[in-house]
């Protein structure tokens, strides 16, 4: 519900400018570390690293998609699977890793010039089991790329990372989605978590910049699972 989403300090897919649709988990963002959910009358932190069975792509991390683990398997036992890298086979956009999309059954880079003007994509945002909007954008909308002319600067409302200028990604903040800076070395990042029935996160960080990966900070190895600090580190 919106209540579980907004009574929180953490976010996932966001809505675009002026009434477009919300994005699927193709945006390269990571959730904030202390994801807060309402528990009774006070905020409660839930840190969940367990693998998560899923019903749809939106329940998985931004670098995952929802599918049966076995080819042609029972759709009733779907789980979050690692996204497909460039040139790998795909059936839909969500199967491809952030920065790519599915074209003719193959994951290709969304950076290619023809991409933005070529597709009109129908996208859906969901909160738990409810189909809803967080800043209210239409829940199922065909969004034309023609809406976007210039790349969004930091703080601009966006739909996906390709709407943002270089060095920025599109990430949710409360009830909307804005261009935020890609993380630099040493900055706190977030490992993706499975999203169950808690509602989507409402505060997202961007991914780590080029040549960096989100890894547990060395001096935090001894810390408990729920307080492990991840930072962007050189490969």
């Amino acid at each position: 519900t919106l209540n579980s989403v907004l009574n929180s300090n953490a976010i996932k897919n966001l809505p675009p400018p002026l009434g477009g649709a919300a994005g699927h988990p193709g945006s390269a963002v990571s959730a904030a570390p202390g994801i807060l959910y309402p528990g009774g009358n006070k905020y409660q932190t839930i840190d969940n690293y367990q693998p998560y069975p899923c019903a749809e792509d939106e329940e998985c991390g931004t670098d995952e998609y929802c599918a049966s683990p076995t080819r042609g398997g029972d759709a009733g036992v779907q789980i979050c699977l690692a996204c497909r890298k460039r040139r790998k086979r795909c059936m839909r956009h969500a199967m491809c890793c952030p920065g790519n999309y599915c074209k003719n059954g193959i994951c290709v880079s969304s950076d290619q010039n023809h991409f933005r003007g070529e597709i009109e994509e129908t996208i859906t945002e969901s909160f738990g089991n409810d189909h809803s909007t967080l800043d209210g954008y239409s829940r199922r909308t065909t969004l034309s790329s023609k809406m976007y002319h210039t790349k969004g600067q930091e703080g601009s409302v966006c739909l996906r990372s390709s709407d943002c200028a270089s060095g920025l990604c599109c990430a949710r903040h409360f009830w909307s989605k804005i261009c935020k800076p890609v993380l630099k070395e040493g900055q706190v990042c977030t490992k993706h978590r499975r999203k169950g029935s808690h509602g989507l996160e409402i505060f997202q960080r961007c991914y780590c910049g080029e040549g960096l990966s989100c890894r547990i900070q060395k001096d935090h190895h001894q810390a408990s699972n729920s307080s492990r600090l991840h930072t962007c580190q050189r490969h």
Epitope: L2, S132, F174, S176
Partner: antibody
Amino acid sequence: QVQLVQSGAEVKKPGASVKVSCKASGYTFTEYTMHWVRQAPGQRLEWMGVIDPSNGDTSYNQKFKGRVTLTVDKSSSTAYMELSSLRSEDTAVYYCARTTGPWFASWGQGTLVTVSS
Amino acid sequence: DIQMTQSPSSLSASVGDRVTITCRASQDISNYLNWYQQKPGKAPKLLIYYKSRLHSGVPSRFSGSGSGTDFTFTISSLQPEDIATYYCQQVHTLPPTFGQGTKLEIK
């Protein structure tokens, strides 16, 4: 253009409830969340809560939880804020506000609610 | 909740003056700061969002800067119509919270 028109001033007795309306026009009502903010005389603005008109989902400031109820009527593009168990310190101007990002871009004109015995 | 403290609470300036208002957050709020203008008997009006982005239709004499916990709102050349109370608002953490306001008057 976007317009949010609120209902008129109200005078209520302590312990009573008040329901303020906010009629939206100039945009698709279900496509933007509606927030409620109040301002007591000479005081700072205070966020009360938010409702998603598309499905009625709500989130409230913990300070008001249990006393405030946000609802919408999609057919008339109207949002409502009901505050119960009124006390004198609830005397304030109540605003509805629509967002486009994490900021309040459009506001209603405000509704003065006076709580007095 | 994050506490927002504005200073000064009120100030008097002449037309054409450069006016500066500061806003301090009780914890780091990155760039998630908005500024609103409110005239007597009217609803607040968004001027600046995300620390320094000018809302559409807002004159360029208004600007914002800062980061982390300390922020500044500036009117480069005060105009008579700028007489109002100005509020900062953090949207880093729920619930969104506002400063107590700075009342701006003409000398």
